[in-house]
């Protein structure tokens, strides 16, 4: 029997200070560039080596960015989202959704490290 793939979704507030070369990441998504089917959200597609985001260490490729400095990123065109980041100032607060893939074992099988029993 195959295991089931589940996702653990968590949210985090990440405060970044813009470095000499900026925030240090790339994004995909937007109403005109759907990266995930049926989701026009903004996702992190690249973390630049030695950039502000990489040095902070919390933002990851695949994270969904929900808001920037309290401004919701829903229903934005891709370029409008890019411009929002570029104009966000020196101290940038990101509300981020991490989606961690969790592989469950076959039904009836107690996985290693299962606390019950």
């Amino acid at each position: 029997m195959n295991g089931r793939v589940d996702y653990l979704v968590t949210e985090e507030e990440i405060n970044l200070t813009r470095g000499p070369s900026g925030l240090g990441f790339n994004i995909v998504g937007g109403t005109d560039q759907q990266y995930v089917s049926n989701d026009s959200g903004i996702y992190v597609s690249r973390i630049k080596e030695n950039g502000a985001a990489a040095l902070d260490g919390r933002l990851q490729e695949g994270d969904k960015i929900l808001s920037v400095n309290g401004q919701d990123l829903k229903n934005l065109l891709h370029q409008d989202a890019v411009d929002l980041f570029r104009n966000a100032g020196y101290a940038v607060s990101l509300r981020v959704q991490h989606r961690l893939q969790v592989q469950n074992g076959p039904i009836g099988h107690r996985g290693e490290g299962d606390p019950s029993g």
Epitope: S21, G22, L23, G24, F25, N26, I27, V28, Q33, Y35, S45, R46, K48, G51, H78, Q79, V82, F85, R86
Partner: nanobody, 126 residues
Amino acid sequence: DVQLVESGGGSVQAGGSLRLSCTASGRTFSTYTMAWFRQAPGKEREFVAAITWSGTYYADSVKGRFTISRDNAKNTMYLQMNSLKPEDTAVYICAAVIGSTVDSYSPSDPLEYDYWGQGTQVTVSS
């Protein structure tokens, strides 16, 4: 990982034309920021042109002669090269990165890109 394969190079007389293609793997090609660089023997790698979600960029040396474009349905980027000159002789290399930088974009900076092709040779004789 993204694989990039260039084609369309060859030998041509000065004043002639060539169209280079760069075909990429990956289901999200439309999100890629892409560029052409070139490298002549004994010289530094040089930026030629780039295409992003919002526009196109060209080196001054090719402006008005070269045109960068893409066909998202074919996962392919093109470089139409007209009025070729002997100084355009080089290996032409395709580069890509997924997404758009949230910082100011420097199309000529190789660090903007994560993926590189092997290149295709263009030779222009006088």
